[in-house]
């Protein structure tokens, strides 16, 4: 796996653990919390990075409506099972034995069971929406000047293909960027649009992954595009299963 | 008014490291924008290089990736490009060029490096 | 990489001839809301010169006999009434991916 070689260290996440014991002295990196390696040229899967943050110290209108199938991430953090390949089990069980359903983003899909409960398979999110909600600026950005440098930020910062960004809307201050990605889209190497969300959510967090980089400064024309609010509605191939008692809730 | 001007070394011997500076006026590379090299071997086409941005972070052409290196000296508000291991297929004339949204609206007026022993 | 593909390679023609020089990318450089599609300027001797951002957007200072249109692959560059100082070579550039590619140019000569 490559990483930066001189010092040994993982540029695509600083939650791991890299030493030079790798095929002819080769730098090596594992995820903290599972010991998985990763491939520090491209991101990390959310899964693994989100057993990573589990086990790390604690101190460390022309817009789009989300759909009635649209998860929101309510449940928050969780240690998750992840599969070899780094992705979510589509089952996910706490230490209580309360169980529940997923999607590839790890966000709960089903009313939660027990131990019993079934999970298929693992559901793909194929779109998501981030809606963001700049401060305030002297005037609106210009449309196409946003489109580019979010596409840009897209494409050079998470290495994801431009053609899995859908779109960019904008109503000042709501922007919206939807990414979609179905499974027959994706090709080998091509990075997640779950993973891409991820590193977007915690990069405007001040949360970066990144080992070493400076925190997300994005600007528009020289324009400082600073976020206030974010909101992510995943939408998986196929609509969530819950009880009407929770969507009456 | 924006300007850009390259400098540097106009002859550099095969296996040698070509160096490059591009001087920006009118302008603080570090207040927003990307700042870019690209490359014209005589006669022929254009070849974009990569670029720095506004905070730091570097893009490169992957065919040029491992031999390139581009920096900046913001008190000087320069942006360099070092080119590695360079042959006789590294001779062109170098540019530098502003990069507002996607595309080059400011560039220097070139520096012809040769590359021969 | 994305490959981008000028023609005519060369063209003559007269003071006052309508010209056009068509680029095709061989993938789309377009978004829902952009066109990342540029054209460029350049005469011998001197760097580029930045005409048409966007496939249509004319930058300031460019004559407004320049134009261009296109999305997707297909795009246009049209001169309406060509001027003496408008003898040159033309490239287009695509920005939807990385690297950033160019056309191979076009060499408008005098007739």
């Known amino acids: 796996h490559t990483a930066a070689q001189d010092n040994c260290t993982c540029p695509t996440n600083k939650m791991t653990v890299c030493s030079p014991d790798g095929p002819g002295g080769r730098c090596q990196c594992r995820a903290l919390g599972s010991g998985m390696a990763v491939d520090c040229s491209t991101l990390t899967s959310k899964c693994l990075l989100l057993k990573a943050r589990m086990s790390a110290p604690k101190n460390a209108r022309t817009l789009v409506r989300p759909s009635e199938h649209a998860l929101v991430d309510n449940d928050g953090l969780y240690d998750p099972d992840c599969d070899p390949e780094g992705r979510f089990k589509a089952r996910q069980c706490n230490q209580t034995s309360v169980c529940w359903c997923v999607n590839s983003v790890g966000v709960r899909r089903t009313d939660k069971g027990d131990l019993s409960l079934r999970c298929d398979e693992l559901v793909r999110t194929h779109h998501i929406l981030i809606d963001l909600r700049h401060r305030p600026t002297a005037g609106a950005f210009n449309h196409s000047d946003l489109d580019a440098e979010l596409r840009r930020l897209f494409r050079e910062r998470y290495r994801l293909h431009p053609k899995f960004v859908a779109a960019v809307h904008y109503e000042q201050p709501t922007i919206q960027i939807e990414l979609r990605q179905n499974t027959s889209q994706k090709a080998a190497g091509d990075v997640d649009i779950g993973d891409a969300a991820y590193y977007f959510e915690r990069d405007i967090k001040g949360e970066s992954l990144f080992q070493g980089r400076g925190g997300l400064d994005l600007r528009v024309r020289g324009e400082p595009l600073q976020v206030e609010r974010t909101l992510i509605y995943y939408l998986d191939e196929i609509p969530p299963k819950f009880s009407m008692k929770r969507l009456t809730a | 008014q924006v300007q850009l001007q390259e400098s540097g070394p106009g002859l550099v011997k095969p296996s040698q490291t070509l160096s490059l500076t591009c001087t920006v006026s009118?302008?603080?590379?570090?207040?927003?924008?990307?700042w870019n090299w690209i490359r014209q071997p005589p006669g022929k086409g254009l070849e974009w290089i990569g670029y720095i941005s506004y905070s730091g972070r570097n893009l490169y052409n992957p065919s040029l990736k491992s031999r390139v290196t581009i920096s900046r000296d913001t008190s000087k508000n320069q942006f360099s490009l070092k080119l590695s291991r360079v042959t006789a297929a590294d001779t062109a004339v170098y540019y530098c060029?502003?990069?507002?949204?996607?595309?080059?609206?400011?560039w220097g007026q070139g520096t012809l490096v040769t590359v021969s022993s | 990489d994305i490959q981008m593909t000028q023609s005519p390679s060369s063209l003559s023609a007269s003071v006052g001839d309508r010209v056009t020089i068509t680029c095709r990318a061989s993938e789309s450089v377009s978004s829902s809301v952009n066109r990342f599609l540029h054209w460029y300027q350049q005469k011998p001797g001197k760097a580029p010169k930045l005409l048409i951002y966007?496939?249509?957007n004319l930058e300031s200072g460019v004559p407004s006999r320049f134009s261009g249109s296109g999305s997707g692959t297909d795009f246009t560059l049209t001169i309406r009434s060509l001027q003496p100082e408008d003898f040159a070579t033309y490239y287009c550039q695509q920005s939807n991916e990385d690297p950033y590619t160019f056309g191979q140019g076009t060499k408008l000569e005098i007739k």
């Open positions: 009118g302008y603080s590379i570090s207040s927003g924008y990307y």
């Open positions: 060029a502003r990069d507002t949204t996607a595309y080059f609206d400011y």
């Open positions: 966007r496939a249509s």
